[in-house]
Interface confidence: medium
Amino acid sequence: DTEIKVNPPQDFEIVDPGYLGYLYLQWQPPLSLDHFKECTVEYELKYRNIGSETWKTIITKNLHYKDGFDLNKGIEAKIHTLLPWQCTNGSEVQSSWAETTYWISPQGIPETKVQDMDCVYYNWQYLLCSWKPGIGVLLDTNYNLFYWYEGLDHALQCVDYIKADGQNIGCRFPYLEASDYKDFYICVNGSSENKPIRSSYFTFQLQNIVKPLPPVYLTFTRESSCEIKLKWSIPLGPIPARCFDYEIEIREDDTTLVTATVENETYTLKTTNETRQLCFVVRSKVNIYCSDDGIWSEWSDKQCWEGEDLSKKTLLR
């Protein structure tokens, strides 16, 4: 009864198509698969960024796989062939591992890469990124930003840089069609006459860095002798009402401060007839139904009522 063996996949490699971190892992079938013509061979692929404690594991019948990686670090991957039990009279057979690694040959010392990278997707419409210069670099150093997301044929360079002291320190992006809910890859590299500059890689999803506009059209309505309804409207732009959370700050007679977080565009406040003045402001943020994270908007303009009986009037300013 001879032991069944299978070879590992051939030509296992990690290919960088120039997408700033989105890499292809590819391989060829193992040698000597002739005995298993009736069998569908599977492959178990494991991969990770070097330094990560956990491997991602995929089982596939394909000869390729694609995923995003952090190119600031190296990548390691291993793969073996799996023969399902149907092919081997009862027990799954695994080959030995084929292994490969990939990394970008780093230029320059780590300190020369940009610091304090900060990107905000304003009102889910305009992406703006800024950075501060790396250490040990001269003022002649220029930084360049490249970006890619699935849907672009190739990585694009920023065409609208923001400068300070003659250096590129930020980028205003053009309209980014169909760019949310997918990984957005950025590389900032640099050139200097006197020394090489280390590249920096960043990956995020645009819906998670949205800073909305503040709410507008704040109003008061007296609902009853002891209740006032505060209302406002969603800010102009592409973000639907279902995507907002709001934070309200209410001041009554310059003393009481009420803060509340609500999911829709109204808030009912318990009050007394003695209330002489009422002011409130609101700000907005994209909620957990539309993103994993977000940035609070600026506060709205303040809306105040004073000195008039709220029961007589709905205020709109």
Partner: nanobody
Framework: QVQLVESGGGLVQAGGSLRLSCAAS????????MGWYRQAAGEQRELVAS???????NYADSVKGRFTISRDNAENTGYLQMNTLKPEDTAVYYC????????????WGQGTLVTVSS
């Protein structure tokens, strides 16, 4: 109006120490990125130390272990402590501040001369 004023430069013997200060007005130092550049005669201005908005410090290889950058947010002042000075540290030192986040302003002091004699 933003103003940065450096002080603390001077003549010092090799192996000695100096502490440069950068007093800021018109800008909130807390959370701002701050860097110390230096420019030797006939050379370009080079960034030798910085402190990020998250208070992470970075140093050029040539000053690592000898220079320490810090700030006092209450005083709105940044500092560069320079120990074991060498003649090649001779330069005009400039303080540079850039407000937090998506701000594209860059503010400079007038510079303070540090001369290290052998």
């Amino acid at each position: 109006q933003v103003q940065l004023v450096e002080s603390g430069g001077g003549l010092v013997q090799a192996g000695g120490s100096l502490r440069l200060s950068c007093a800021a007005s018109g800008i909130i130092f807390s959370g701002a990125w701050m860097g110390w550049y230096r420019q030797a005669a006939g050379e370009q201005r080079e960034l030798v130390a910085s402190i990020t908005s998250g208070d992470i410090t970075n140093y050029a290889d040539s000053v690592k272990g000898r220079f320490t950058i810090s700030r006092d947010n209450a005083e709105n002042t940044g500092y560069l402590q320079m120990n074991t000075l060498k003649p090649e540290d001779t330069a005009v030192y400039y303080c540079n501040a850039r407000p937090r986040g998506l701000s594209f302003s860059s503010y400079w002091g007038q510079g303070t001369l540090v001369t290290v004699s052998s």
